[in-house]
Interface confidence: low
Amino acid sequence: CKAMHVAQPAVVLASSRGIASFVCEYASPGKATEVRVTVLRQADSQVTEVCAATYMMGNELTFLDDSICTGTSSGNQVNLTIQGLRAMDTGLYICKVELMYPPPYYLGIGNGTQIYVIDPEPCPDSDF
């Protein structure tokens, strides 16, 4: 397993609608045709997988139908969008990139993007 550098922004603030977008860029050492991108969330020393997608270079990323992630790829950059975020989802979101094919296999893990999610304030005239 060979190491590969992955860059991602340090901090991103989610929109008031709970949507956060960031770019995950990897330094591909060769011409990969199949790439796997995984978003991991680290909070309280627990790491959980948020979503993952495999894509062929030049094609769109395909996440599960019920995934909270969407994304597009352009060269060695992946534009990731995570939606449906709440304040409790604030945490470090790590981008993991694997060059699945052809060999050799490369693995790169970014330092993570701290996503801050602020729940919207209730309307002044609401009952809350």
């Epitope: 397993c1 199949e34 796997r36 995984t38 959980t48 997988e49 948020v50 979503c51 993952a52 997608a53 495999t54 062929m56 395909t62 599960l64 694997e98 094919y101 052809p102 060999p103 050799p104 296999y105 693995l107």
Partner: antibody
């Protein structure tokens, strides 16, 4: 030792659903992808789907899309396969299998540990 | 996506060598160097014999060897033994996190 132990045989009516479990022991379950493969009586092996180490990603064979759901519970080291809208041709032995490819990285693809199989019979 | 094509049956005498073939397409066997081979005795679970085209897991006899060229993979068993009588299946990675098995080959030791 490393093993996968599956739930017992099931008899179901057409149109029903079945959920088969596969409990892992002897290895670090959260690090491995898990497959489901089936084998109809007297037939060959047929790949159904795979689930990633923490369950965030699943891929199913086109033939089973919309009918199969693979899930896993890391707390009990168990992976599940649920097949809905059963028909007689779904009568088969269903196997879970561990993928050698480990999420910490590696270039080894092969199903190196298999469960004992679960016979699902669909009959009216 | 239909199964990979395997010879339906093959037979040999003890001590002989036999070869099982597995033919795929340019989107599975030919596209990826990720063919694995399994042996299955009647009413038993399959056992991994070969992975990544030619590698043997620890504990598998060196009588088993494999090779891939283009869209065809082959498994050779040398020094045939009675316990080799079983079904043999090839399997290939097919991209996008999907796999495909061969239809299976029945080996008879005469």
């Amino acid at each position: 030792q490393v093993q996968l132990v599956q739930s017992g045989a099931e008899v179901k009516k057409p149109g029903a659903s079945v959920k088969v479990s596969c409990k892992a022991s002897g290895f670090s379950f959260p690090n491995y992808y898990m497959h489901w493969v089936r084998q109809a009586p007297g037939q060959g092996l047929e790949w159904m789907g795979i689930i990633s180490p923490t369950g965030g990603s699943r891929t199913y064979a086109q033939k089973f899309q919309g009918r199969v759901t693979i899930t896993r519970d890391t707390s009990t080291s168990t992976v599940y396969m649920e097949l809905s809208s059963l028909r007689s041709e779904d009568t088969a032995v269903y196997y879970c299998a561990r993928e050698m490819y480990n999420w910490n990285g590696g270039w080894d693809y092969g199903m190196d540990v298999w469960g004992q199989g679960t016979l699902v019979t669909v009959s009216s | 996506q239909s199964a990979l094509t395997q010879s339906a049956s093959v037979s040999g005498f003890p001590g002989q060598s036999i070869t099982v073939s597995c033919v795929g397409t340019n989107s599975d066997v030919e596209a990826y160097d990720l063919v694995s081979w399994y042996r299955q005795h009647p009413d038993k679970s399959p056992n991994l014999l070969i992975y990544d085209n030619y590698k043997r897991p620890s504990g598998v006899s060196d009588r088993f060897s494999a090779f891939k060229s283009g869209n065809t993979a082959s498994l050779t068993i040398s020094g045939l033994q009675a316990e080799d009588e079983a079904y043999y299946y090839c399997c290939s990675y097919a991209g996008f996190s999907t796999w495909i098995f061969g239809a299976g080959t029945q080996l008879t030791v005469l």
